[in-house]
């Protein structure tokens, strides 16, 4: 089999509040009922895990309570939102999708979404 294809947008600009959203879509070779989605950040060849969630098809994604990610799923599409981003978090955010159950296991890795984060300028002090 070929690698499971995972598609995601090439570039996303975070909002002024440090929130970025993007869609991660995968071409499922089978009828998966349990899916694991992991967001990885790659910068200067260093890779770190941002967040991960396992969900049952048709159910909501459940991230850990302290996660900076939230998301929803619809079919073979996952809508991901990352919050609390700052300029130093700019980087390539890669969507990794694993079809956990039923067997066989499939793994697909997207080419990444370059998220640009610009810290807002502080408001000037008022003279009033």
């Amino acid at each position: 089999c070929k690698a499971m294809h995972v598609a995601q947008p090439a570039v996303v600009l975070a909002s002024s509040r440090g929130i970025a959203s993007f869609v991660c879509e995968y071409a499922s070779p089978g009828k998966a009922t349990e899916v694991r989605v992991t967001v990885l950040r790659q910068a200067d060849s260093q890779v770190t895990e941002v967040c991960a969630a396992t969900y049952m098809m048709g159910n909501e994604l459940t991230f850990l309570d302290d996660s900076i990610c939230t998301g929803t799923s619809s079919g073979n599409q996952v809508n991901l939102t990352i919050q609390g981003l700052r300029a130093m978090d700019t980087g390539l955010y890669i969507c990794k999708v694993e079809l956990m159950y039923p067997p066989p296991y499939y793994l697909g890795i997207g080419n990444g979404t370059q998220i640009y984060v610009i810290d807002p300028e502080p408001c000037p002090d008022s003279d009033f």
């Epitope: 089999c1 070929k2 690698a3 499971m4 992991t38 990885l40 790659q42 060849s45 260093q46 890779v47 770190t48 895990e49 390539l92 890669i94 990794k96 694993e98 296991y105 793994l107 697909g108 890795i109 080419n111 990444g112």
Partner: nanobody, 126 residues
Framework: EVQLVESGGGLVQPGGSLRLSCAAS????????IGWFRQAPGKEREMVSC????????KYADSVKGRFTISRDNSKNTVYLQMNSLRAEDTAVYYC???????????????????WGQGTRVTVSS
């Protein structure tokens, strides 16, 4: 279905050598990372060595540099790990892993691996 089958493990004396083989099947992409990982009792799985299918970039753990050599035979879809000057601390179960990456991904990063073989045990003892 992706299958990775390891062989070549066994019992060897300190200072000895072993050659591990990993035969990959069921995966038709010509771009991937494939490598060797090991897990000693009570420890986490760690990368030993890895090679990129296209271009042949390699990576080694500091603890095995100069002693272990990874190579591949793309015509046989097989990767080899030549292990020389073996030490007691090399004792572990050795796993073959595959990462279905593309050129944008960092070479041989453990986060990208997901396909695993069953493992082959290597014991270094006198």
């Amino acid at each position: 279905e992706v299958q990775l089958v390891e062989s070549g493990g066994g019992l060897v004396q300190p200072g000895g050598s072993l050659r591990l083989s990993c035969a990959a099947s069921g995966f038709s992409s010509d771009y991937y990372d494939i490598g060797w990982f090991r897990q000693a009792p009570g420890k986490e799985r760690e990368m030993v060595s890895c090679i990129r299918s296209s271009g042949g970039s390699t990576k080694y753990a500091d603890s095995v540099k100069g002693r272990f050599t990874i190579s591949r035979d793309n015509s046989k879809n097989t990767v080899y790990l030549q292990m020389n000057s073996l030490r007691a601390e090399d004792t572990a179960v050795y796993y073959c892993g595959l990462a279905p990456i593309s050129p944008v991904h960092a070479v041989c990063n453990q986060h990208y691996f997901g396909y695993w073989g069953q493992g082959t045990r290597v014991t270094v003892s006198s």
